[in-house]
Interface confidence: low
């Protein structure tokens, strides 16, 4: 039968399975998070988004998954990332007291997924989807990440760091989401501080990057939100990891 | 510093029901599991479950579902567990205790311990 | 449920000896490389103590005489050289099913 045709990839082939896999899996690695009916959180998740027209999902769709997978980050423990994930992550698995989204349940569930139904059939569509410069923003994973970007944001507390990408032309990015939804959901009255981690590209690059004038525009759009500012250059990404891994080795005294 | 204060000793009729109360202070209480933990003379630790007031969300052991209710009240920071249909073996100290949080699911703060006796 | 076997139900010693807990699991409590094994002591009218988390971690303030051990379905805590406050009740946990589960406990007493 006719389908649309989306400018984007198909749902992620066995996305149901994969779903339910991961929850499992999620809940036998962290027990904390037992409670969690991963049916139910399964049917929320295929109620947010399927017999929906792709075009039109809100985030109060997604607010039954949301309330289902509701966890927290103790103070000080948040790591946002932009344009960086794969170290962010890194990072994360090594020092196990902090957590990006990803580290989290609903963030764990659809990291590096893609998914849509159709309106009016209960199908998910593996053909395509939409994507977000050429067919809408508002379809199903964009507002999937939107959704519990602003909440993890809303969430974090006391000091709440950064990864953002020193190899790029705009190290911070305002149309990013750390730039367009979790910067502006940190809540002042209980985040102190913001610090970014600008890492660096080149061996060789020993530039002052938080002096880059996207940086500076960061510091601006935060220090208006009464979140004081700090920024640090990881001039040796590896070195950095391998710090973080052993801090007494003798050359984790000198500068990362 | 992380603090669980329970409500004191209890002394209960055989079939009737009791509410044990473990208020905590020092740390966000909805980020955290709240599990109980029975210990009944001479016969060691036995688990009966755990409440994440964050959402509500509730884990029991079978042996305890149906007798045992966890409910938690974020306004007050505090947890409860209530036994319905009390019987002589439910006559032991109940503990409140709190993991480490994600990653570190084991216990590593308790409250004092309230000795519920049972009588006939 | 997963049943945990503590051997010895008595141990005698005296201060300064190795005393050598094991705790037997009936199925694996291993899950993505950790042992989700937990030592607790326990005096009389207090609630328990952590001692050792996931097998071998000691937990935070406990002096490096206690240590753990093990994988799989064999765990032992092991305390050496002993103190005059070691001797307590221990019991080991696991975690990796429900329902979270402890073992009968060894009383470490005095010799």
């Known amino acids: 039968r006719w389908r649309q045709q989306w400018s984007g990839s198909g749902t992620t082939s066995r996305f149901p399975e994969t779903v339910l896999a991961r929850c499992v899996k999620y809940t036998e690695v962290h027990p904390e998070m037992r409670h969690v009916d991963c049916q139910s959180v399964w049917d929320a998740f295929k109620g947010a988004f399927i017999s929906k027209y792709p075009c039109n999902i809100t985030e109060e769709d997604y607010q039954p998954l949301v309330k289902l997978g509701t966890q927290t980050v103790p103070c000080n423990k948040t790591l946002l990332w932009s344009r960086i994930k794969d170290l962010a992550h890194q990072f994360t698995q090594v020092q196990r007291d902090m957590f990006t989204l990803e580290d989290m349940l609903l963030g764990y569930l659809a990291d590096d997924l893609t998914w849509c139904g159709e309106f009016n059939t209960f199908e998910i569509n593996y053909q395509s989807c939409p994507d977000w410069r050429k067919d809408c923003s508002n379809n199903p994973v964009s507002v999937f990440w939107k959704t519990v970007s602003r909440r993890f944001a809303e969430t974090a507390c006391g000091v709440v760091h950064v990864m953002l990408n020193g190899s790029r032309s705009k190290i911070f990015d305002k149309n990013s989401t750390f730039g367009s939804v979790e910067v502006h959901n940190l809540q002042p009255e209980k985040v102190q501080a913001l610090e970014a981690w600008v890492i660096h590209g080149g061996r060789e690059d020993s530039r002052d990057l938080c002096q880059d004038p996207t940086i500076k525009e960061l510091e601006s759009i935060i220090s208006k939100r009464n979140i004081r500012f700090f920024c640090k250059n990881i001039y040796r990404p590896d070195k950095f990891l391998q710090c973080v891994k052993n801090p007494e080795d003798s050359s984790c005294l000198s500068g990362i | 510093q992380v603090q669980l204060v329970q409500s004191g000793a209890e002394v209960v009729k055989s079939g009737a029901s009791v509410k044990v109360s473990c208020k905590a202070s020092?740390?966000?209480?909805?980020?955290?599991?709240m599990h109980w933990v029975k210990e009944a003379p001479g016969q060691g630790l036995e688990w009966i479950g755990y409440?994440?007031?964050?959402?509500?969300?509730?884990n029991y052991n079978q042996k305890f579902q149906g007798r045992a209710t966890l409910t938690a009240d974020t306004s007050a920071s505090t947890a409860y567990m209530e036994i319905s249909s009390l019987r002589s073996e439910d006559t032991a100290v109940y503990f409140c205790?709190?993991?480490?949080?994600?990653?570190?699911?084991?216990?590593?703060?308790w409250g004092q311990g309230t000795l519920v006796t049972v009588s006939s | 449920d997963i049943v945990l076997t503590q051997s010895p139900a008595t141990l005698s010693l005296s201060p300064g000896e190795r005393a050598t807990i094991s705790c037997r699991a009936s199925?694996?409590?291993?899950?993505?490389?950790?042992?989700?094994m937990h030592w607790y002591q326990q005096k009389p009218g207090q609630p328990p103590r952590l001692l050792i988390y996931?097998?071998?971690s000691r937990a935070t303030g406990i002096p490096a005489r206690f240590s753990g051990s093990g994988s799989g379905t064999d765990f032992t805590l092991t305390i050496s050289p002993l103190e005059p406050e070691d001797f307590a009740v221990y019991y080991c946990?696991?975690?990796?099913?429900?329902?979270?589960?402890f073992g009968g406990g060894t009383k470490l007493e005095i010799k």
């Open positions: 205790a709190r993991t480490g949080g994600l990653r570190r699911a084991y216990f590593t703060y």
């Open positions: 020092g740390y966000t209480f909805t980020s955290f599991n």
């Open positions: 409440i994440y007031p964050g959402n509500g969300g509730t």
């Open positions: 199925e694996s409590v291993d899950s993505y490389g950790n042992g989700f």
């Open positions: 996931l097998a071998s």
């Open positions: 946990q696991q975690n990796k099913e429900d329902p979270w589960t």
